[in-house]
Each structure stands twice: as structure tokens, then as C-alpha cells.
């Protein structure tokens, strides 16, 4: 039985849609993560960011190797014991988004509203179309504000 | 509008294999991921794998690794699952769908009419 | 795999009065606030058809009766008032994790 101090520490487990599962688990040394019990497996060493365990780990201390994520498809962005990277996002042209920085193996893809689409909230996981102005323009549609359109009889100054 | 055509069935005898198709149209086929479903007779839906028609990347459900393989044709915006070394376990209706994708949660916004796969000798 | 259990396994519900139907994950299938958990309705000799996606949110086209609700291991479809049309087979799916996973379905019908 485990006798000296316990602590609960975070341990990211990836899984294969690119989403993160934080599990809290039991571990005896508070600045390693060897022989961290994990899932009922028994994994020694992390992968670093970029790759995944070439398998799953096993009770008898067989340690895979760990093997890189598929570039531009997945990829961890933190060290972990999964043997599955996380899935990259896709920006969904039907959300109204469009790529700004391409997926890596250490980092999920960013997206943005595509031109003439906005989106007013922190998270945007889906962009609206600009308003198209009938009787001109205030103020000019931005990636985060839709267009303010001057009302009918209104006059220009 | 979407749409993605299915032919509407298939006959083919045990041991052989079936490549089924699905045109896509209404949309850039290239733009979106192309998912396949299983469906028994009477029964539920079982996912096969995906493909993206951009660069013909292949992700598959563990189960059917050996038993479907995917491939596109963007010059004809065509998707294909040919279906190996047939058993009367593989007879089922298939469908391919369209993905989408809403902050890395993944779902199927368009259905093919699905082929029904009728294995016998 | 994720196992979705789908329950009652099939009901019958009154025109106008609330039909509710229940997912249950074997696991979680949220990340960071966000629920993976997908709805469809089938129709006999039918393609299934998309209804909720994220939990919560309507597939453009499908009326605001139909709702999703839940998070974790709970998700529950409701359908207020249901109408003629409704009468078919519901599945869940997540997507929060390989392979994705359908339930078993639930045949709604109308009395």
C-alpha cells in the first residue's frame, strides 16, 4: 500500500476526436509522473506534445514507444500517456469559418469568420453573414461586429 | 441544394467484393470530410470510417480495418467504399453522409439515400 | 468503445402532449463545457436525418419542438407537441471519441 504522501494530479488523456479528458488520478511523487497508474494500464513515461503512445501501456511495465501524430490531421499539445492524438479541428466553411493557422502536430487549427462574416462572442464556433446595407452604410461589417446600416430616409450628410 | 446519390442496390455472391458509390453535388466536395454508416436489416447504425476528399486521408473504425476501404474521385466529386471478401454478415444497407464540424464535435448533416448490399450465392 | 444506451426502447406518445427520450453514455462525452452528442431521426426506408447536433443546437430546417438537452453522461431528446409526422426511430451519437457510436434507437409512436 502506498505510504508516503498522496497527492491528485491532472493528467490529460487525449482521445481520438481531438478532446481533452481530465481525469484526476492518484500519484506519489508530486514532480514525477513515473509509474503513474492511468485507465488500468501502467504507463512509466509521458509522450511530449507531438506524439502518442504507440499503444496502449500495459500492467507489466512494458513501455511502447512513443510515435508522432499524423501532421495537419492531429496532434497534443501537452504531454500525455494516450496512445491517440488529438483529432484537428476543422473550420467548417457552413459555420461561416475559414483556416487562420494550419493544425501542427503540437497545435489545434485556429479559425476565423470568413471574409464578410462576423462573429460578436469570445468563441466563435459559427459566423454569421454581414448584413448587405439597402440604404448605405454607418459603419462597415469587422470580423467581430456586424454592418450598421443607415435606415430608409435617412440623409447623407 | 446537398445532395448525395446512392445507386440503390447491390447483389453480389460470398467471398466476392462491392465498391459502392456516392456522388456528392450542391456543395465543394473537397470541403468536407465524407463519413460511411452500416445499417442491418432491422437493426442500428454502426459507423465504418471517414475520408477526406481533399487529400484522401483515411480514418476507420477498428472493426471494419480490412473490410472497407475508402477513395474519392474529385474530378467527378465522387465518393467510394469497396467492401471485401463478402459474408451474409456484410448484407445491410450503407450509407455515406456529409461531416460537419461544430468546435471539434463531429456529426452528419447530409445523408445519401443509402445501397442495400444483399450477399448470396 | 463508448456504449449509448437509449431508453424506453420504444414509446407512444399522444398528438400535442411531450415526448421524451433518454441517452445515457457509458462515459462522458464532454470536453471543457462542450457535449459531443448528436440526434436522428429515421423513417422506415429512409436515410436518417439530422436534428441536434452539440447537444443543444437545432439543424437549420428542424422545428423548435424538437430540443436536446444534457451534458456528461445524460442527454435526453424531447419533442412538445409531437405531431403526426414525428412517428419514427430516434438514435443518439457521439462523437467524442473513436469509433463514433450510435445508440440502439427508439421507436416513437403516435396515438
Known amino acids: 500500500r502506498l505510504s508516503s504522501k498522496s497527492v491528485n494530479a491532472q493528467v490529460t488523456d487525449i482521445n481520438s476526436k481531438g478532446l481533452e479528458l481530465r481525469k484526476t488520478v492518484t500519484t506519489v511523487e508530486t514532480q514525477n509522473l513515473e509509474g503513474l497508474h492511468h485507465d488500468g494500464q501502467f504507463c512509466h513515461k509521458p509522450c511530449p506534445p507531438g506524439e502518442r503512445k504507440a499503444r496502449d501501456c500495459t500492467v507489466n511495465g512494458d513501455e511502447p514507444d512513443c510515435v508522432p501524430c499524423q501532421e495537419g490531421k492531429e496532434y497534443t499539445d501537452k504531454a500525455h500517456f494516450s496512445s491517440k492524438c488529438r483529432r484537428c479541428r476543422l473550420c467548417d466553411e457552413g459555420h461561416g469559418l475559414e483556416v487562420e493557422i494550419n493544425c501542427t502536430r503540437t497545435q489545434n487549427t485556429k479559425c476565423r469568420c470568413k471574409p464578410n462574416f462576423f462573429c460578436n462572442s469570445t468563441v466563435c464556433e459559427h459566423c454569421d453573414p454581414c448584413t448587405k446595407c439597402e440604404h448605405g452604410i454607418i459603419k462597415e461589417c469587422t470580423l467581430t461586429s456586424n454592418t450598421k446600416c443607415k435606415e430608409e430616409g435617412s440623409r447623407s450628410n | 441544394q446537398v445532395q448525395l446519390q446512392q445507386p440503390g442496390a447491390e447483389l453480389v455472391k460470398p467471398g466476392a467484393s462491392v465498391k459502392l458509390s456516392c456522388k456528392a453535388s450542391g456543395y465543394t466536395f473537397t470541403s468536407y470530410w465524407m463519413q460511411w454508416v452500416k445499417q442491418r436489416p432491422g437493426q442500428g447504425l454502426e459507423w465504418i470510417g471517414e475520408?477526406?476528399?481533399?487529400?484522401?486521408?483515411?480514418n476507420y473504425n477498428q472493426k471494419f480495418k480490412g473490410k472497407a476501404t475508402l477513395t474519392v474521385d474529385t474530378s467527378s466529386s465522387t465518393a467510394y467504399m469497396q467492401l471485401s471478401s463478402l459474408t451474409s454478415e456484410d448484407s445491410a444497407v450503407y450509407y455515406c453522409?456529409?461531416?460537419?464540424?461544430?468546435?471539434?464535435?463531429?456529426?452528419?448533416?447530409?445523408w445519401g439515400t443509402g445501397t442495400t448490399v444483399t450477399v448470396s450465392s | 468503445d463508448i456504449v449509448l444506451t437509449q431508453s424506453p426502447a420504444s414509446l407512444a406518445v399522444s398528438l400535442g402532449q411531450r415526448a421524451t427520450i433518454s441517452c445515457k453514455a457509458s462515459q462522458s462525452v464532454d470536453y471543457d463545457g462542450d457535449s459531443y452528442m448528436n440526434w436522428y431521426q429515421q423513417k422506415p426506408g429512409q436515410p436518417p436525418k439530422l436534428l441536434i447536433y452539440?447537444?443543444?443546437n437545432l439543424e437549420s430546417g428542424i422545428p423548435a419542438r424538437f430540443s436536446g438537452s444534457g451534458s456528461g453522461t445524460d442527454f435526453t431528446l424531447n419533442i412538445h407537441p409531437v405531431e403526426e409526422e414525428d412517428a419514427a426511430t430516434y438514435y443518439c451519437?457521439?462523437?467524442?471519441?473513436?469509433?463514433?457510436?450510435f445508440g440502439g434507437g427508439t421507436k416513437l409512436e403516435i396515438k
Open positions: 475520408i477526406d476528399p481533399s487529400d484522401s486521408y483515411t
Open positions: 453522409a456529409r461531416n460537419r464540424d461544430y468546435s471539434n464535435n463531429w456529426y452528419f448533416d447530409v
Open positions: 451519437q457521439q462523437s467524442n471519441e473513436d469509433p463514433r457510436t
Open positions: 452539440a447537444a443543444s
